[in-house]
């Protein structure tokens, strides 16, 4: 029951997390104009991964897409890639985890197969969450660097007469959404991995055998020994761990693929 709850909760948390990652990726407020030095601006600038927007004094917001691909900063391209990889992995993870849910019966699927699928989806969620957190963190670092660079040459004088305030950008709402969503996806993935440990069928190493000693009619069942020493639980853990390690090795190929994105 606890395993089903852990798996179900892991799925729901990951689902919320991936929805958040998608939302963050689509949002326009990755960076917003810092109003500290210009609180009276009637023109408010903010930027996303795909377009930049300006809210004017009329309340009208005009957005312009980044219609160039080659002209964009490499860091922005990297952030886009990380977020998309996170979404794709998360979506595949969700698809896999639906079939892995203990509460859903699909034909005569073995519990061991469900355990492997749960672990696979869990690892996918973990990598997805890490991709989102990495993407948002790279963008945040980019903002901090640019912020202090623009602060250094804040005012560009025109013949020393007129001052033009350079627009500085600070953290937008999308960054916080991305961090939280990435964290949730990561937590959901860990929960799926934990649930996987309790999903594999319990296997006894010995069949119950009756030994007939001469003159006695006592049935000796080593299964009783298993329960008292905890040997069975060790066997269970070992069994799942071995299976888990194999699945984990298979999934390890994913991060290396990201190197080429």
């Amino acid at each position: 029951m606890a395993v089903t709850a852990c798996q179900g909760l892991g799925f729901v948390v990951s689902l919320i997390g991936i929805a958040g990652i998608i939302a963050a990726t689509c949002m326009d407020q990755w960076s917003t104009q810092d109003l500290y030095n210009n609180p009276v601006t009637a023109v408010f600038n903010y930027q996303g991964l795909w377009r930049s927007c300006v809210r004017e004094s009329s309340g009208f917001t005009e957005c312009r897409g980044y219609f160039t691909l080659l002209g964009l900063p490499a860091m922005l391209q990297a952030v886009r890639a990380l977020m998309i990889v996170g979404i794709v992995l998360g979506a595949i993870g969700l698809l896999v985890s639906i079939f892995a849910l203990k509460c859903i019966r699909i034909g005569s699927m073995e519990d061991s197969a469900k355990a492997n699928m749960t672990l696979t989806s869990g690892i996918m969620f973990i990598v997805s969450g890490l991709c989102a957190i990495a993407g948002v963190s790279v963008f945040a670092n980019m903002l901090v660097t640019n912020f202090w660079m623009s602060t250094a040459n804040m005012y560009t004088g025109m013949g020393g007469m007129v001052q033009t305030v350079q627009t500085r950008y600070t953290f937008g709402a999308a960054l916080f959404v991305g961090w939280v969503a990435g964290g949730l996806t990561l937590i959901g993935g860990v929960m799926m991995c934990i649930a996987c440990r309790g999903l594999a069928p319990e296997e006894t190493n010995y069949k119950a055998v009756s030994y007939h000693a001469s003159g006695h009619s006592v049935a000796y069942k080593p299964g009783g020994f298993k329960a008292s020493t905890g040997f069975g639980s060790n066997t269970k853990n070992k069994k799942i761990y071995d299976g888990g390690a194999r699945t984990e090795d298979e999934v390890q190929s994913y991060p290396s693929k990201h190197d080429y994105v």
Epitope: S57, S58, F60, T164
Partner: antibody, heavy 115, light 113 residues
Framework: EIQLQQSGPDLMKPGSSVKISCTAS????????IHWVKQSHGKTLEWIGY????????RYNQKFEGKAALTVDKSSTTAYMHLTSLTSDDSAVYYC????????WGQGTLVTVSA | DIVMTQSPSSLTVTAGEKVTMTCKSS????????????LTWYQQKPGQPPKLLIS???TRQSGVPDRFTGSGSGTDFTLTISSVQAEDLAVYYC?????????FGAGTKLELK
């Protein structure tokens, strides 16, 4: 057709208050701020402030803070400007303006403050 | 507050003449976010509300004759009427649309000889 229809002229006593209305039609009322502008006789235009019909948020020119209060009624797509403690300096034509770059203006409301 | 200075305060012209009026702002009206200058020009005829002519320094409003041209960047802006018509006689205001409080110039009055 987009229109901003303002209330009629008002002759007010010094110290009294007046409420001018501006009813918008022909566009999405909550999508654009309603700005208010004062034009004293033979003088330039002065921006009073704006109200966001979407959430009722306001911003005022410091000069008119305490003098003008902006409100909105979404159901009737009407914006209001309440001017208090009227003096002869408040005698002017008051305009409401909206849409991008103040594309549309009301016809103006003449407020005359006289004893 | 951004101060808008218009010159000349009045202009006396003959029909068909080319007219240029200027507007200077005390601070730059250039928004680095989209590289647009938030300077607006209005025309006001007696007894009427102002009418939008040009937004963002050079974008002519639809329905405005092409004899009206806006130019300039940063702090210096110009409104040019290539060939003045009788119906152009009015007061022309420039407006800072970049920073609160939004401010208007004192206006340039266009009169016929």
């Amino acid at each position: 057709e987009i229109q901003l229809q303002q209330s009629g002229p008002d002759l007010m006593k010094p110290g009294s208050s007046v409420k001018i209305s501006c009813t918008a039609s022909g566009y999405s009322f909550t999508s654009y701020y309603i700005h208010w502008v004062k034009q004293s006789h033979g003088k330039t235009l002065e921006w009073i402030g704006y109200i966001d019909p979407f959430n009722g948020g306001t911003r005022y020119n410091q000069k008119f803070e305490g003098k003008a209060a902006l409100t909105v009624d979404k159901s009737s797509t009407t914006a209001y400007m309440h001017l208090t403690s009227l003096t002869s300096d408040d005698s002017a034509v008051y305009y409401c303006a909206s849409l991008r770059f103040f594309t549309y203006w009301g016809q103006g409301t003449l407020v005359t403050v006289s004893a | 507050d951004i101060v808008m200075t218009q010159s000349p305060s009045s202009l006396t012209v003959t029909a068909g003449e080319k007219v240029t009026m200027t507007c200077k702002s005390s601070q730059s009206l250039l928004n680095s976010g989209n590289q647009e200058n938030y300077l607006t020009w209005y025309q006001q005829k007696p007894g009427q509300p102002p009418k939008l002519l040009i937004s963002r320094a050079s974008t002519r409003q639809s329905g405005v004759p092409d004899r009206f041209t806006g130019s300039g960047s940063g702090t210096d802006f110009t409104l040019t009427i290539s060939s003045v018509q009788a119906e152009d006689l009015a007061v022309y205001y420039c407006q800072n649309d970049y920073s609160y409080p939004l401010t208007f110039g004192a206006g340039t009055k266009l009169e016929l000889k």
